[in-house]
């Protein structure tokens, strides 16, 4: 079949824009650390890079291959307010490179870490 | 309490970066349209803007207040491959503005649309 060059160009552009790579995301700090329901953070979210995007096949998953850590200072508030906001410094995982990996490899990797 | 200017500056920066606004996201086309498991798209994902980020309170949700539509042409593949890829034209909702809305208002809005 012969396809319009414009269509092929726009499809190629879509591939590039949606590929597996570090992407800026908003992390809800309370959810990320599973804190008590009466503990709140201001701001409630931070911006970090995490692997995201799509892989070319169902059996592949976009995973981080290297990680740095970013230190951010936030205010922690505990309800009822017996004292004012406390500054807390939290280290967040920041994905610096990513790769489409087989879901089986990811599973093996996670389980070998758990077994260690 | 008196807080370090640097800390306040970085917190303000975090607020700005994580606020509710249109963000570029990857949409898995097959999942978005809930198609049959033997229907695939190439590319599998497209890049559009959707509202995202954090609101200042638990009771608020980041919602779109205006939407445009982006037309994209992809290839649809049905397995087993009895014929080649077929072009499909998809009009994707692209959020152009967002607001933190009360979850109750969102619920009412959705249900008033459903009842119409």
């Amino acid at each position: 079949a012969h396809y319009n060059t414009e269509i092929l160009k726009s499809i190629d552009n879509e591939w590039r824009k949606t590929q597996c790579m570090p992407r800026e995301v908003c992390i809800d700090v309370g959810k990320e650390f599973g804190v008590a329901t009466n503990t709140f953070f201001k701001p409630p979210c931070v911006s970090v890079y995490r692997c995201g995007g799509c892989c070319n096949s169902e059996g592949l998953q976009c995973m981080n291959t290297s990680t740095s850590y970013l230190s951010k200072t936030l205010f922690e508030i505990t309800v009822p307010l017996s004292q004012g906001p406390k500054p807390v410094t939290i280290s967040f995982a920041n994905h610096t490179s990513c790769r489409c990996m087989s879901k089986l490899d990811v599973y093996r990797q996670v389980h070998s870490i758990i077994r260690r | 309490a008196h807080y370090n200017t640097e800390i306040l500056k970085s917190i303000d920066n975090e607020w700005r970066k994580t606020q509710c606004m249109p963000r570029e996201v990857c949409i898995d086309v097959g999942k978005e349209f809930g198609v049959a498991t033997n229907t695939f798209f190439k590319p599998p994902c497209v890049s559009v803007y959707r509202c995202g980020g954090c609101c200042n309170s638990e009771g608020l949700q980041c919602m779109n207040t205006s939407t445009s539509y982006l037309s994209k042409t992809l290839f649809e593949i049905t397995v087993p491959l009895s014929q080649g890829p077929k072009p499909v034209t998809i009009s994707f909702a692209n959020h152009t503005s967002c607001r933190c809305m009360s979850k109750l208002d969102v619920y009412r809005q959705v249900h008033s649309i459903i009842r119409r």
Epitope: - | K31, E32, F33, G34, V35, A36, T67, Y69, I90, S91, F92, A93, I114
Partner: nanobody, 118 residues
Framework: EVQLVESGGGLVQPGGSLRLSCAAS????????MGWYRQAPGKQRELVSA???????LYADSVKGRFTISRDNSKNTVYLQMNSLRAEDTAVYYC????????????WGQGTQVTVSS
Amino acid sequence: EVQLVESGGGLVQPGGSLRLSCAASGSSFSPYAMGWYRQAPGKQRELVSATTSGGSTLYADSVKGRFTISRDNSKNTVYLQMNSLRAEDTAVYYCYMHWRGSDPENYWGQGTQVTVSS
């Protein structure tokens, strides 16, 4: 249990129109996505059109400009308006509905026959 019932199929001359509808019963929630596939004799089932509650729509290029998909969330119903019908549109048309959630579910109709012939 969710059930989908299609209607509106039939015999029509080339150039004619039909409106298919598909209604879901058994769910109080509106599906996230709804759409239509078709299967011609001896051929694979192919995607024709789909729509999401977010307003996105999909059309196979073979029907673009001739078919229009629409939905009525209050009735959990999806429609396919088919104009300028051609002989190659002859097929059994199946609707589907997709509910999102932790365990996404798809439901299918039993199919309605569309025959385009003079």
